[in-house]
């Protein structure tokens, strides 16, 4: 029968009595960055070349007897859920191996930098196919670690890390809070985030998705037939760089940022109960399980958009937040979030020749989050249209002016402290989609693209007594680049994206009487791209 | 994820750059800056990395840990540089008392040092 | 599905001695912990011993140190109980179980994680009677 | 050796009670603690692992809690399937030890 972990990351139409996706990743190499490995298990025997390198701090304690078994334990599972012939995700993956860990599973940063620069200076001397760098290990957050994993990732190297074990934010670890890395935190056969002793997963912005990493079986270092359960999100990473030399050996061409796109567009949704996190971290933890694409070709015509949610801003009154999106993906909108509802909107702006999108707290604010809506969006040409605060009543317009551009984002961001308090909602006139509108007193911008064949629309969800949550989703075969609330509503805490859906949070309804003040009107924009439709039908 | 400005502590210690009269006297207005793990049991005193900006060649890496070494000799530390880094980040690893910190981050072309810590297989 | 079947049960006298194999199907047999445990007619549950995935660790409950050996072949997924020196009080139905359990890694100590005996098989019948 | 004392011996209830039994160590097993159930002539089946989680598969009206010394198990509403004996189980080291079980009769 098939181990749990694999029927769970593997789509229905590749479940048979054995696991034998196609092309299991031989295209591609696996760097492993772990403790010693026993590379002559029958599970990895063949697959994994171990290299000369090693840098490992001596054990703790007088009395430590090393033991190969042990010293071996970590490494020599994970290459075996990587690529092991029985129990692997990726079955032709080929794999190498560094040694940064001593036999208690303990290393440096130090060591860890010194191991990517061997990877960096291997990949110069022999270039060969896509590479994936799996680093299961984790520690304090790290500047230099972080920037390090950064160089490595735009050199084109994937690298796939563990969120870490301390059922924590994932953002005070490193390299788990490096932006560029792809981070894993672990769920179980019940789909539940992983307790691990007294701990657990790791979870939070920082975390990229889920995947198995607990009773994970895979070769045991205890003899060259042995097999053992482990836990971890180790294991967790482990899956996902399998998945990732899969994808990788299915379209060698494709960049990191494409790479983790399809990472979250195959997994499944919404399946964590997200209960096991707490409270202010589940808005900010991705529900996303990592799972093989239905097919290797094809996902290539979709338009790929996902959330990236920034740090904190802090409760200071000029506080700000600023979400990125990574160096190849378009920046589609900007919204914020504040869980006191005290906040003053949000921009998009041009820093470093990038659009950023960046939150403001209000006076009195415990702090506010911005949220960019990062897409992947070839030849795309996008600007921001900015409208001052308006002297009419009717309220701030802006639309997309120029020839064959679409509206894929709205913001609106206030200098005011109490905008909208005591206002009458502004409604958008039918018929006029291809604008942003917002109260007088705010300045609206209007996120305008043109790439080939995109094009866009609004979808609005309005309830009219008070609810918590407003959602609007988009139909199959458009993805959603924008979501905002329709402003009016004063009690509005914020919107955001998740997966294909617009959710705008209100305050708690018991706190806001059932007025007209209590309406709430989710938009989302929902695009999609003909051009990547067509070309995808060509390629095929 | 993470911004890089973020949760972790930061010590930023000011240049004099009178001090010790370098002839690559750091660019004026520019601060160095000091990191080291929060997590205090994870820390490894005494093992520094030396980041350098970016665009530094080897050669001035490897005259910067020079000239560490012998201005640490002029106040009476033993200093070794355990590594060169070159290829995804130019810099070095050193190990030396955390009393010459403030020398090391008036070096030219510093632009942090991180204290070495500890990680972990997950 | 992991299935575990038990043989070997059967009626012996005291002193003597007999085998018990357990059966396993998968991979995953190797993966665990394995432990036997005895049920003697109209009594409740007692662990009888256990021993590790690579049968590098085993250990046993005081009444039968010494005269039980439990063993396992990784090649054939079968665990064994050898039972010598056989006395009336170990009359019972002997099942073999599987300890589910996993190791794990926080902060520089390897871990187990134990959850239970999660698979049992059907039980054999030892009768030590003259 | 951890001695494992189970209360009472014997539970006589009805379908839709609460029901609570008691387990106690003779020493700290912090919450190495399973609970099984066992039908007569069938094998024991794994209900409840390190004293408050719940197996796969197992219904929600089954839970665990405690720590130490003192755990129970509660079946928030019996249903007629619930009528069997149950166990708890120490694993506090690899040696492990039972209690001496708990049957649950209709009233």
């Known amino acids: 029968s098939i181990p749990w972990n694999l029927e769970r990351i593997t789509p229905p139409r590749y479940r048979a009595d054995e696991y034998q996706p196609p092309d299991g990743g031989s295209l591609v190499e696996v760097y492993l960055l772990d403790t010693s490995i026993q590379s002559d298990h029958r599970e990895i025997e063949g697959r994994v070349m171990v290299t000369d390198f090693e840098n490992v701090p001596e054990e703790d304690g007088t009395r430590f007897h090393r033991q190969a078994s042990k010293c071996d334990s970590h490494g020599t599972h994970l290459a075996g859920v990587v690529s092991g012939r029985d129990a692997g995700v990726a079955k032709g993956a080929s794999m190498r191996s560094l040694r940064v860990l001593n036999c208690q599973g303990k290393g440096t940063v130090s060591g860890t930098l010194i191991g990517l620069e061997f990877i960096r200076k291997s990949q110069l001397v022999q270039p060969v196919g896509p590479l994936v760098v799996l680093l299961p290990l984790a520690g304090g957050y790290s500047r230099v670690l972080n920037a390090a994993c950064q160089r490595l990732a735009r050199a084109g190297v994937v690298l796939v890390t563990a969120a870490g074990n301390f059922r924590d934010d994932a953002c005070l670890y490193s390299p788990a809070s490096a932006p560029e890395v792809i981070t894993v935190g672990a769920t179980n056969a019940q789909d539940q985030p992983v307790t691990l002793g007294t701990l657990g997963t790791n979870f939070g912005r920082c975390v990229d998705l889920f995947a198995p990493g607990e009773d994970i079986i895979g070769a045991s270092s205890d003899c060259s037939t042995c097999f053992v359960s482990q836990s971890g999100t180790s294991q967790a990473a482990a899956h996902v760089a399998g998945i990732a030399a899969m994808m990788l050996s299915a379209e060698p061409e494709l960049t990191l940022a494409e790479l983790r796109q399809r990472l979250i567009h195959f997994s499944a949704k919404d399946v964590i109960n997200e209960a096991w996190f707490p409270e202010d971290q589940r808005v900010l933890t991705p529900n996303l399980v990592a799972a093989l694409p239905p097919s290797t070709h094809g996902a290539g015509w979709q338009l790929f958009c996902r959330t990236v949610w920034s740090a904190h801003s802090g409760p200071t009154r000029m506080a700000t937040a600023v979400a990125r999106c990574a160096p190849d993906e378009e920046l589609l909108s900007c919204s914020s979030f504040s869980r006191s509802g005290k906040r003053r909107g949000e921009r998009m702006e041009a820093q470093g020749g990038k659009l950023v999108c960046r939150a403001h707290n209000a006076f009195g604010g415990e702090g506010v989050y911005a949220i960019a809506r990062c897409c992947l969006l070839p030849q795309a040409n996008c600007s921001v249209h900015t409208a001052p605060p308006a002297e009419a009543s009717m309220g701030t317009r802006v639309h997309c002016h120029q020839q064959g551009h679409v509206l894929t984002g709205c913001s609106s961001h206030w200098e005011v402290e109490d905008l909208g308090t005591h206002k009458p909602p502004v409604l958008r006139p039918r018929g006029q989609p291809n604008q942003c509108v917002g109260h007088r007193e705010a300045s609206i911008h209007a996120s305008c693209c043109h790439a080939p064949g995109l094009e866009c629309k609004v979808k609005e969800h309005g309830i009219p007594a008070p609810q918590e949550q407003v959602t609007v989703a988009c139909e199959e075969g458009w993805t959603l680049t924008g979501c905002s609330a329709l402003p009016g509503t004063s009690h509005v805490l914020g919107a955001y994206a998740v997966d294909n859906t617009c959710v705008v949070r209100s305050r708690d309804v018991s706190t806001t009487g059932s007025t007209s003040e209590g309406a709430v009107t989710a938009v989302a924009i929902c695009c999609r791209s003909r051009h990547l439709a067509q070309a995808s039908q060509e390629l095929q | 994820q993470e911004d890089e400005d973020g949760d972790y502590e930061e010590l930023v210690l000011a240049l004099r750059s009178e001090e010790d009269g370098l002839a690559e006297a750091p660019e004026h207005g520019t601060t160095a800056t000091f990191h080291r793990c929060a997590k205090d049991p994870w820390r490894l005193p005494g093992t520094y990395v030396v980041v350098l900006k970016e665009e530094t060649h080897l050669s001035q890496s490897e005259r910067t840990a020079r000239r560490l070494q012998a201005q640490a000799a002029r106040r009476g530390y033993l200093t070794k540089i355990l590594h060169v880094f070159h290829g995804l980040l130019p810099g070095f690893l050193v190990k030396m008392s955390g009393d010459l910190l403030e020398l090391a981050l008036k070096l030219p072309h510093v632009d942090y040092i991180e204290e070495d810590s500890s990680v972990f297989a997950q | 599905e992991v299935q575990l079947v038990e043989s070997g049960g059967g009626l012996v006298q005291p002193g003597g001695s007999l085998r018990l194999s357990c059966a396993a199907s998968?991979?995953?047999?190797?993966?665990?912990?394995m432990s036997w445990v005895r049920q003697a007619p109209g009594k409740g549950l007692e662990w009888v011993a256990n021993?590790?995935?690579?049968?590098?660790?085993?250990y046993y409950v005081d009444s039968v140190k010494g005269r039980f050996t439990i063993s396992r072949d990784i090649a054939k997924n079968s665990l064994y109980l050898q039972m010598n020196s056989l006395r009336a009080e170990d009359t019972a139905v002997y099942y073999c179980?599987?300890?589910?359990?996993?190791?794990?890694?926080?902060?520089?100590?390897?871990?187990?994680?134990?959850?239970?005996?999660?698979?049992w098989g059907q039980g054999t019948t030892v009768t030590v009677s003259s | 050796d951890i001695q494992m004392t189970q209360s009472p011996s014997t539970l006589s209830a009805s379908v839709g009670d609460r029901v609570t039994i008691t387990c106690r160590a003779s020493q700290s097993i912090s919450s190495w603690l399973a609970w099984y159930q066992q039908k007569p002539g069938k094998a024991p089946k794994l209900l409840i692992y390190?004293?408050?989680s719940l197996e796969s598969g197992v219904p929600s009206r089954f839970s665990g809690s405690g720590s130490g010394t003192e755990f129970t198990l509660t079946i928030s509403s019996l249903q007629p399937d619930d009528f069997a004996t149950y166990y708890c189980?120490?694993?506090?080291?690899?040696?492990?030890?039972f209690g001496q079980g708990t049957k649950l009769e209709i009233k």
């Open positions: 390190k004293a408050s």
């Open positions: 179980a599987r300890d589910r359990g996993t190791y794990y890694f926080q902060s520089g100590s390897y871990n187990y994680y134990y959850y239970g005996m999660d698979v």
């Open positions: 021993i590790k995935q690579d049968g590098s660790e085993k």
């Open positions: 189980q120490q694993y506090n080291s690899y040696s492990y030890t």
């Open positions: 998968g991979i995953t047999f190797s993966s665990y912990w």
